[in-house]
């Protein structure tokens, strides 16, 4: 079986998936569902997954949820929250995805793949 995916490749694939989501918005993403905003800092992959995993019935982000789980070292389930969430701020999934995409672009440019 193939070896582990290099971090740079995994991050690139995640960015490409977020690009696809951003590009293919014909109607409000996930019917305009709201999710908790997160601090885009260390541990953000788990925080992002914790936030998005609470969105159900939205096929557009299912692949993103799976990909984020590959970046998060622990199992994440719905209703689970870390200190990285800005618990007083909810934003639309579309805005969440855009913010995450732009932050990951910065990380990729800076060579911060983990």
């Amino acid at each position: 079986s193939p070896g582990p995916v290099p971090p740079s490749t995994a991050l690139r694939e995640l960015i490409e998936e977020l690009v696809n989501i951003t590009q293919n918005q014909k109607a409000p993403l996930c019917n305009g569902s709201m999710v908790w905003s997160i601090n885009l800092t260390a541990g953000m992959y788990c925080a992002a997954l914790e936030s998005l995993i609470n969105v159900s019935g939205c096929s557009a982000i299912e692949k993103t949820q799976r990909m984020l789980s590959g970046f998060c070292p622990h199992k994440v389930s719905a209703g689970q929250f870390s200190s990285l969430h800005v618990r007083d701020t909810k934003i639309e999934v579309a805005q969440f995805v855009k913010d995450l995409l732009l932050h990951l672009k910065k990380l990729f440019r800076e060579g911060r793949f983990n």
Epitope: T22, Q23, Q25, Q95, L102, K105
Partner: antibody, heavy 122, light 108 residues
């Protein structure tokens, strides 16, 4: 230092053809999407065409689709624009621009050439 | 196709703040870039990804984007800031790059 140098502009009659080139240096050419943007005299910027880093995906403005063809030779670090069936309204300065990320669609253009003037007139 | 609307001109006194708007339907969901173009010169990227500044661009240049309006803000305007400014997005519904019509900034 990133450099983009356009060439191939000039005077051409309506219905004629022209091929623009953009020689790139100072960056890993194949890793970035590239684009052509034009500016008619005294007018604003108008996007013409774009191409992915591999050359596998191409995009065109409606005004040039079917007449212009964008391509690239990554072994020569060169971007091309083949312009056929030229019209008077194609008269403009044509800029070559580098996308600031490998996926050229959502990103901006961080480096531009100085442009080459194309004049379509009889 | 997607349309970006900019005011044709904005005037401001030196030292004041200039705000150049770029209107578009739900532009807040898109990623906006801004270019400065001086007469006879190629455009220069001054703000990318809504609000980031390329290296070498003064901190006086900043951007924001939400709702139906993106804004380029130039604080402490200098005479050298006089130029045309263009906003730009990618329109995924048409697979086109879209530029605004441009705004001429005049420093009084």
């Amino acid at each position: 230092e990133v450099q983009l140098l356009e060439s191939g502009g000039g005077l051409v009659q309506p219905g004629g053809s022209l091929r623009l080139s953009c020689a790139a240096s100072g960056f890993t050419f194949s890793s970035y999407a590239m684009s052509w943007v034009r500016q008619a005299p005294g007018k604003g910027l108008e996007w013409v065409s774009a191409i992915s880093g591999s050359g596998g995906s191409t995009y065109y403005a409606d005004s040039v689709k079917g007449r212009f063809t964008i391509s690239r030779d990554n072994s020569k670090n060169t971007l091309y624009l083949q312009m056929n069936s030229l019209r008077a309204e194609d008269t403009a300065v044509y800029y070559c621009a580098k996308a600031d990320f490998w996926s050229g669609t959502l990103w901006g253009f961080d480096y531009w050439g100085q442009g080459t003037l194309v004049t379509v007139s009889s | 196709s997607y349309v970006l609307t900019q005011p044709p001109s904005v005037s401001v006194a030196p030292g004041q703040t200039a705000r150049i708007t770029c209107g578009g339907n739900n532009i807040g969901n898109k990623i906006v870039h801004w270019y400065q173009q001086k007469p006879g010169q190629a455009p220069v990227l001054v703000v990318y990804d809504d609000s980031d500044r390329p290296s070498g661009i003064p901190e006086r240049f900043s951007g924001s984007n939400s709702g139906n309006t993106a804004t380029l803000t130039i604080s402490r305007v200098e005479a050298g800031d006089e130029a045309d400014y263009y906003c730009q997005v990618w329109d995924s519904s048409s697979d086109h790059v879209v530029f605004g019509g441009g705004t001429k900034l005049t420093v009084l």
